[in-house]
Interface confidence: low
């Protein structure tokens, strides 16, 4: 079956800046700002767009060692990000995958609302464990608040549109590490 859980949470950070840091550069930021929650993120394949597979590893002491995420959609205009947890963690005999949608919406006060949808695709008649949903929500909240704190402390970070130009790269826009580009373009 499919079990859908929807939540909303607010942030004082403007939507565009939060999307840039929390979504586009989360791979780099999470191990830095929340090492107690995420120990590393590695791009397994892809260039950051749909189809990209990432391995997120957790530090010792957490219930799971790792999960693998598949990027399904990155909408830079509407600050929307869809991805699915496809391996590791809770995925197994009873749970096939978790499809997640995050949309960041600007609020009049200059902050933002994160609208989050988590669809748990279970195998057969299995139900979703409440503690799993709770743990997942807590992890998301931990990461969000850690990134939020970082952005409040570093007022110049992720503010200006300072993407590296194609001219600088001698190639396409760079939104991921050189190794990841190499994986995508040369293999």
């Amino acid at each position: 079956g499919v079990f859908n859980y929807e939540t909303e949470t607010t942030s004082v950070i403007p939507a565009a800046r939060l999307f840039k840091a929390f979504i586009l550069d989360g791979d780099n930021l999470f191990p830095k700002v929340a090492p107690q929650a995420i120990s590393s993120v590695e791009n397994i394949e892809g260039n950051g767009g749909p189809g990209t597979i990432k391995k997120i590893s957790f530090p010792e002491g957490l219930p799971f060692k790792y999960v693998k995420d598949r990027v399904d959609e990155v909408d830079h205009t509407n600050f929307k990000y869809n991805y699915a947890v496809i391996e590791g963690g809770p995925i197994g005999d009873t749970l096939e995958k978790i499809s997640n949608e995050i949309k960041i919406v600007a609020t009049p006060d200059g902050g933002s609302i994160l609208k989050i949808s988590n669809k748990y695709h279970t195998k057969g008649d299995h139900e979703v464990k409440a503690e799993q949903v709770k743990a997942s929500k807590e992890m998301g909240e931990t990461l969000l608040r850690a990134v939020e704190s970082y952005l409040l402390a570093h007022s110049d970070a992720y503010n200006e549109q300072k993407l590296i130009s194609e001219e600088d790269l001698g190639g396409e826009q760079k939104l991921i590490s050189e190794e990841d580009l190499h994986h995508h373009h040369h293999h």
Epitope: K32, S39, E42, Y158, K162, I164, D168, K174, S177, E178
Partner: antibody, heavy 118, light 113 residues
Framework: QVQLVQSGAEVKKPGASVKVSCKTS????????ITWVRQAPGQGLEWMGW????????NYAQNVQGRVTMTTDTSTSTAYMEVRSLRSDDTAVYYC???????????WGQGTLVTVSS | DIVMTQSPDSLAVSLGERATINCKSS????????????LAWFQQKPGQPPKLLIY???TRESGVPDRFSGSGSGTDFTLTISSLQAEDVAVYYC?????????FGQGTKLEIK
């Protein structure tokens, strides 16, 4: 703590091959790539390439492409770099290094001196 | 390739005085959509591997004395040792890790005057 321990010094003749090992410990080997850097006597640091310990993907510097092969053995958490068709200007200390989650070169092996001499 | 050029090639500074080493990159070393400059500074003493001092141009690595500081952005970067100590005698390298090949500066040899 994170440690990278490299194999001992080697003396090779021109045209021969050398394989340097880098045994890692203190972290999950497959979560981080391994970079190789060399330093000729009295010279600066030269990046040689990188290998993903997760899937073996590689990225070699242009000047060593074709003569260098980087591999890993996940069962022993060890990275290897082989240099073929050695020349005298390959005489150098070879270092392995592990990047941090933030991508900088944080942890280094102690270095392996490779001397190429007839 | 991004070319990293350090100046000066060698530097002699009195104990307790300030030492400044410059590094210029041929291209910006900004990474992704953040404002982080992917530039590191290393210290290397004879017979030892390089030791990371600074990353992101200005963030001190854990355990590095606070007399070491990094600054700069764009293409111009500086490593400053506010009060030179005897154990700071070494060769210092800047390195960009934004775009492969990850290039190093040619090194600056720091000595005591």
């Amino acid at each position: 703590q994170v440690q990278l321990v490299q194999s001992g010094a080697e003396v090779k003749k021109p045209g021969a091959s050398v394989k340097v090992s880098c045994k890692t410990s203190g972290y999950t080997f497959t979560n981080y790539g391994i970079t190789w850097v060399r330093q000729a006597p009295g010279q600066g640091l030269e990046w040689m390439g990188w290998i993903s310990a997760y899937n073996g993907n590689t990225n070699y510097a242009q000047n060593v492409q074709g003569r260098v092969t980087m591999t890993t053995d996940t069962s022993t958490s060890t990275a290897y770099m082989e240099v073929r068709s050695l020349r005298s200007d390959d005489t150098a200390v070879y270092y392995c290094a592990r990047r941090s989650s933030m991508l900088h070169f944080q942890h280094w092996g102690q270095g392996t001196l490779v001397t190429v001499s007839s | 390739d991004i070319v990293m050029t350090q100046s000066p090639d060698s530097l002699a500074v009195s104990l307790g005085e300030r030492a400044t080493i410059n590094c210029k990159s041929s291209q910006h070393v900004l990474y992704d959509s953040s404002n982080e400059n992917y530039l590191a500074w290393f210290q290397q003493k004879p017979g030892q591997p390089p030791k990371l001092l600074i990353y992101w141009a200005s963030t001190r690595e854990s355990g590095v004395p606070d007399r070491f500081s990094g600054s700069g952005s764009g293409t111009d970067f500086t490593l400053t040792i506010s009060s030179l100590q005897a154990e700071d005698v070494a060769v210092y390298y800047c390195q960009q890790y934004s775009s492969a090949p990850y290039t190093f500066g040619q090194g600056t040899k720091l000595e005591i005057k």
